[in-house]
């Protein structure tokens, strides 16, 4: 009889080579049984992982497992680093393996981003 | 159940290059890494490397970067090795092996292939 | 990279007796997530590996419970409490907390 606990099916060590300015989705697959769990992602800095509160997110429904998915829309250079998923069932906090991006930017360093990314990111301007 | 079924023997001249394959069953090959380990005559296990068939990404031992490939089919549930610029050096068993969501590390591993390299 | 050092070379027992095997890392193969990523194999003659033990001390399934794992840190034992003729062959350590993953140069089982 298969576990009826939240189970997280994030590769450990894995890894993903992207670029910037490009849409990416990262996945953390997602077993439940009944009650779909609350689930967060957050970013390693160090040792803490730092809660992604406004970013865009998303669940894929498939028919053994669900996939919570976080949005690059677009990708920047500084997204790069490693990510945790996390899911609150029954009082537990489950946390996923880390997943790391490595992400190359194709612009040169000097180069603004572009309105889009303004757009899309607003609270860059307030860095 | 589940099974890694490697190809057959090689017998190839030095400077060409080779593809082994290892066909898995019984489970997605999405969901595991597929490590490949070489085996010299009489001599100990080398870790080769490995790949995220999930989306291609490859881990190599430094030392052996540059003249093994790993890829992979997720259509096929099959992953490769590629060895090219073949020396007597690269005279060995390759094995495959698997390493579920990363945590399993070489739970299931193939049966071997020869690859003997010769004038 | 880590450098996995197996001692001893050889091990000469008796069927019945009991046997150890080290294996010592050159670093702690403690990971960030709190496990220790170290493996034990059993070749035998003319055989692909087979995985034993996992986590230092889980054992495999259909291993027998006369095989134990421990340690932590740096320093890990595989012990073998009355050898059987099935066990012969060369054990393996195998480090998969650090790239590149390392494996031990293998001890070798065998009879007196």
């Known amino acids: 009889k298969e576990s009826c606990d939240v189970q997280l099916y994030i590769k450990r060590q894995s890894e993903h080579s992207i670029l910037a300015g490009d849409p990416f989705e990262l996945e953390c697959p997602v077993k439940y049984c009944a009650n779909r769990p609350h689930v967060t992602w957050c970013k390693l800095n160090g040792t803490t992982c730092v809660k992604l509160e406004d970013r865009q997110t998303s669940w894929k429904e498939e028919k053994n497992i669900s996939f919570f998915i976080l949005h690059f829309e677009p990708v920047l250079p500084n997204d790069n680093g490693s990510y945790r998923c996390s899911a609150n069932f029954q009082s537990n906090l489950i946390e996923s393996h880390s997943t790391t991006l490595y992400v190359t930017d194709v612009k040169s360093a000097s180069e603004r981003p572009s309105k889009d990314e303004m757009a899309s990111r607003p609270w860059l301007l307030y860095r | 159940e589940v099974q890694l079924q490697q190809s057959g023997a090689e017998l190839v001249r030095p400077g060409a290059s080779v593809k082994l394959s290892c066909t898995v069953s019984?489970?997605?090959?999405?969901?595991?890494?597929v490590h490949w380990v070489k085996q010299r005559p009489e001599q100990g296990l080398e870790w080769i490397g490995r790949i995220d068939p999930a989306n291609g990404h490859t881990k190599y031992d430094p030392k052996l970067q540059g003249t093994a490939t790993i890829t992979a089919d997720t259509s096929s549930n099959t992953a490769y090795l590629q060895l090219s610029s073949l020396t007597s050096e690269d005279t060995a068993v390759y094995y495959c092996?698997?390493?579920?969501?990363?945590?399993?590390?070489?739970?299931?591993w193939g049966q071997g292939t020869t690859l003997t390299v010769s004038s | 990279e880590v450098v996995m050092t197996q001692t001893p070379l050889t091990l000469s027992v008796t069927i019945g007796q009991s046997a150890s095997i080290s294996c010592k890392s050159s670093?702690?193969?403690?990971?960030?997530?709190?496990?220790?990523?170290l493996n034990w194999f059993l070749q035998r003659p003319g055989q692909s590996p087979k995985r034993l033990m996992h986590?230092?001390?889980k054992l495999d399934s259909g291993v027998p419970d006369r095989f134990t794992g421990s340690g932590s840190g740096t320093d890990f034992t595989l012990k073998i409490s009355g050898v059987e003729a099935e066990d012969l062959g060369v054990y393996y350590c195998?480090?998969?907390?650090?790239?590149?993953?390392?494996f031990g140069g293998g001890t070798k089982l065998e009879t007196k």
């Open positions: 670093q702690s193969l403690l990971d960030s997530d709190g496990k220790t990523y």
């Open positions: 986590l230092v001390s």
């Open positions: 195998w480090q998969g907390t650090y790239f590149p993953y390392t």
């Open positions: 019984g489970f997605n090959i999405k969901d595991t890494y």
């Open positions: 092996a698997t390493d579920y969501y990363g945590s399993s590390l070489l739970d299931y």
